[in-house]
Each structure stands twice: as structure tokens, then as C-alpha cells.
């Protein structure tokens, strides 16, 4: 690596991301055939102009406006399902539950999950050694700018009731500083948006607490009502029988509590 | 090969109805997007409607949403346009399209005409 | 007024070379595949470029079509007799939810 080079302390950026990124569109431009006419090199190329030869940690929502422009994706607004420590599960939930939709579920978000990139002022290099950390380095790098342009959108595009699934194995279910906490929270639109219903995972097989009067959960309530959007919560006792019985909601067992 | 045939098509008074039928043959029609074009008379082409396959997605012109409806049943092979309130501006020739994968329209029928005229 | 704007007509003579431009916005051409259409008189619009620059088989290789930013065009070379139609270009818009259509080229073979 050349002496001259910014060392960052994040990783760097995803190996083969260009290709990735256009493998990833083209993919999901055949599962989503309402997307066939999305042209994935154009998108590339967006995508590309946001970070590349800026500063990795001068990196506004505006450089992403480009890329936003294809974000106009038709979701169904009443069926977003949000989350927040608890991707897994939310992904596993909407590929059985087909009709509701993630973030990740999207164009946008589909192309970045997982993934980690930068670039380097004035020149047309793409970063692999390292990419600024969020904490360490900065908060406006082209990762984290990114996840709160797209989700900051795909809140304000919600309506009716939006779910939120929230991991109670955390000790604090429901995080300020987390995406949710942070961006979505603040963007759902009140004249749009009746309720939010959060969905709270146990992680324990004998807990059997009720995490719906946990003091985030009670904080949330109070950010979300002060926002004159209801709010409503559940519990989630056993997330396992939970996916299974929205694959299989005819089942005796899954008219008890999950 | 792949044969698009549209009827339905003739002479009707404003704010009358119309039902054109397209009849395809020589590929799997229940697997492809299918389409409705139109051509009025000394102008361009204008794209009026589409519909998915699968669980039937509908896409309209403004021109035309509120008053045309596309439909399809693959049983039968055939794609429909019911036209309600027809205006003067609906006079055109109208043509069936599939659509391929890439979004293009790679197949079309000859087309009818409708003459929207009091 | 078309959404996507073209040239009423361009013309050459036998042999030359015409290209037909297309310009659009970042909601249709931007972000989504140019497709390019041939339209005869009587006859039923012709496929000739899809992807911004495939050609369907059949379609001679004189026919070839580009895309950048958010323009696209389409070039005609060794230009024949037969290539005197009607030409569109089309594309999706976001902004619509459908596809827009070019207002059309005549090109006359002099």
C-alpha cells in the first residue's frame, strides 16, 4: 500500500464490488419483473458517481440523489416491515411472507446489504484496504450516508399500519442510535402512517416476560405518540414457531400465543 | 411463430364503449407481460396499457386511466382492452404487443382501428 | 409533446450513414433500457434495437443504437431504400409507472 494513503479504521471495501453490485441488479431485475426496463449498468454508474473521487468522509445525502432518482420503486406503502438488530429474521419473515417488503427487499437495498465500499479524493480509485469507520472515523462516510438516504425514503414512503421487528436478547430493544431509532423513526409521516406496531423477538426458549413494557419499548411509545402516530406492540415468544406459522397459518398449534 | 390478432376494433359515438380482444398463439402466454399501442391518425406511437403475468399487475397512460381496462386469461390465449367514455382522441389504430424480458415489445398484431365519431 | 424528443426527420442518401437522436430525462432514459422501433406505413411496428444496443436476429447490423447519460440515439449505415419509415424510441419512466415513446423520425432515403 502507498505511504500516501488515508489508513481508515473500518475494513475496506468489498472485494469485487463493482461486479457484485451489477450482478446483484441484473439478479434482481429477473426475480422482480416489474423492474425488467431497469438498466443495470446506468445503475452502476450512479451508484459509482456517489463516492467515487470524494472524500470518504465528506460524503453527503446529495451525492446519493443520482441513485435516489431510480428509488421511486413501487412497495406497497402499507406493507413495510422495519427492523432493528434483527435482519435475519425479518429477511426469513418476508421471503415466507412475500407480500410485505424490507428495506433489503428493495432495489436499492438488496444492491448494498452487506456490503462495504469507499473510495479516495481526486482520484478514480475504489478503496480495499480500509474505509472509515463510523465511530472511529466518521459519520459521514459513503456506507453510513447511504443507509440513512435509503432509509430515511423508505420511511417516509410507509403508510397505514408499518411494522418494526426488535431484538428482546438486546439491552435496549428499542436503540436511539440505531437506524430505526435514528431515521425511521423520525421520518414516518403522521397524516400517512396510523400505527406502529412493533414486534418484539425473545430470544430465550422459557422467557416468557412481557418486553412490550421494557423502558425503550415505553420510550419509543412516547417518541411515536408524541408524533401522533399510534403505537402497538406484541411479543414474539417463539420466533421459530412464529415463521412457521406464516408459512403454515392453517396449523392447530398457531392460534396460541407465539 | 409467435401471432398476435386483434378484433373488436369499428365505429363508435363518444362516450360509448368498445371491447378489443387480442387472440396470441406460438408461445407460452401466461409467462409474458402483454401490452396495448396505439397510433392516431398522422401522429406516433403512444403506449396505452400493460398487464403482468402471474397475479395480474395493471399499468395505465394517464391518458386512458379511468376509462380502459386491461385484462387477460391465459386459458383462452386472448388479452382484452374494455374502453368506457370513449373521447374523439381515442381514434386510433390499436395494437397488441408482448413483451419480452428486457421490457421490449418483440411481437405485435396488425391492429384495428377504432373511430371514436359522432 | 412527447417525453422523450426526437428530430421530426432526418434523410441521406443511398450508402450514408443517419443517426437518429433521442433525448430524455434521468426517469425514463436515465436509469432504464432504450428501445428503438421501426414503423412502416400499413405494417405493424418492427423491434429493432432493445437493451440500448442488442439487435433481435434479423435485424441487420447497419441498425446500431447507444445510450448515454440520458440521451440515447440510433444509427442507420449504408443506408437503403428500404430503411425509409418511421422510427421511435422508448423507453420506461419512473415518474409515469409506463413506457414513453419518442415523437418519431421519418427518414427519407434521397
Known amino acids: 500500500v502507498p505511504r500516501w494513503r488515508q489508513q481508515w479504521s473500518g475494513p475496506g471495501t468489498t472485494k469485487r464490488f463493482p461486479e457484485t453490485v451489477l450482478a446483484r441488479c441484473v439478479k434482481y431485475t429477473e426475480i422482480h419483473p416489474e423492474m425488467r426496463h431497469v438498466d443495470c449498468q446506468s445503475v452502476w454508474d450512479a451508484f459509482k458517481g456517489a463516492f467515487i473521487s470524494k472524500h470518504p468522509c465528506n460524503i453527503t445525502e446529495e451525492d446519493y440523489q443520482p441513485l435516489m432518482k431510480l428509488g421511486t420503486q413501487t412497495v406497497p406503502c402499507n406493507k413495510i416491515l422495519l427492523w432493528s438488530r434483527i435482519k435475519d429474521l425479518a429477511h426469513q419473515f418476508t421471503q415466507v411472507q412475500r407480500d410485505m417488503f424490507t428495506l433489503e427487499d428493495t432495489l436499492l437495498g438488496y444492491l448494498a446489504d452487506d456490503l462495504t465500499w469507499c473510495g479516495e479524493f481526486n482520484t478514480s480509485k475504489i478503496n480495499y484496504q480500509s474505509c472509515p469507520d463510523w465511530r472511529k472515523d466518521c459519520s459521514n462516510n459513503p456506507v453510513s450516508v447511504f443507509w440513512k438516504t435509503v432509509s430515511r425514503r423508505f420511511a417516509e414512503a410507509a403508510c397505514d399500519v408499518v411494522h418494526v421487528m426488535l431484538n428482546g436478547s438486546r439491552s435496549k430493544i428499542f436503540d436511539k442510535n440505531s437506524t430505526f431509532g435514528s431515521v425511521e423513526v423520525h421520518n414516518l409521516q403522521p397524516e400517512k402512517v396510523q400505527t406502529l406496531e412493533a414486534w418484539v423477538i425473545h430470544g430465550g426458549r422459557e422467557d416468557s416476560r412481557d418486553l412490550c413494557q421494557d423502558p425503550t419499548i415505553k420510550e419509543l411509545e412516547s417518541i411515536i405518540s408524541k408524533r401522533n402516530i399510534q403505537f402497538s406492540c406484541k411479543n414474539i415468544y417463539r420466533p421459530d414457531k412464529f415463521l412457521q406459522c406464516v408459512k403454515n397459518p392453517e396449523d392447530s398449534s398457531c392460534t396460541s400465543e407465539i | 411463430q409467435v401471432q398476435l390478432v386483434e378484433s373488436g376494433g369499428g365505429l363508435v359515438k363518444p362516450g360509448g364503449s368498445l371491447r378489443l380482444s387480442c387472440a396470441a398463439s406460438?408461445?407460452?402466454?401466461?409467462?409474458?407481460?402483454m401490452s396495448w399501442i396505439r397510433q392516431a391518425p398522422g401522429k406516433g406511437l403512444e403506449w396505452v396499457a400493460s398487464?403482468?403475468?402471474?397475479?395480474?399487475?395493471?399499468y395505465y397512460a394517464d391518458s386512458v386511466r379511468g376509462r380502459f381496462t386491461i385484462s387477460r386469461d391465459n386459458a383462452k390465449n386472448s388479452l382484452y382492452l374494455q374502453m368506457n367514455s370513449l373521447r374523439a382522441e381515442d381514434t386510433a389504430v390499436y395494437y397488441c404487443?408482448?413483451?419480452?424480458?428486457?421490457?421490449?415489445?418483440?411481437?405485435w398484431g396488425q391492429g384495428t382501428l377504432v373511430t371514436v365519431s359522432s | 409533446q412527447s417525453v422523450l424528443t426526437q428530430p421530426p426527420s432526418a434523410s441521406g442518401t443511398s450508402g450514408q450513414r443517419v443517426t437518429i437522436s433521442c433525448s430524455g430525462s434521468s426517469s425514463n432514459i436515465g436509469f432504464h433500457f432504450v428501445y428503438w422501433y421501426q414503423h412502416l406505413p400499413g405494417t405493424a411496428p418492427k423491434l429493432l434495437i432493445y437493451k440500448n444496443n442488442q439487435r433481435p436476429s434479423g435485424v441487420p447490423d447497419r441498425f446500431s443504437g447507444s445510450k448515454s447519460g440520458n440521451s440515447a440515439s440510433l444509427a442507420i449505415s449504408g443506408l437503403r431504400s428500404e430503411d425509409e419509415a418511421d422510427y421511435y424510441c422508448a423507453a420506461w419512466d419512473d415518474s409515469l409507472s409506463g413506457y414513453v415513446f419518442g415523437s418519431g423520425t421519418k427518414v427519407t432515403v434521397l
Open positions: 398487464v403482468s403475468s402471474g397475479r395480474p399487475t395493471t
Open positions: 404487443a408482448r413483451e419480452d424480458w428486457g421490457g421490449e415489445f418483440t411481437d
Open positions: 406460438g408461445f407460452t402466454f401466461s409467462d409474458d407481460y
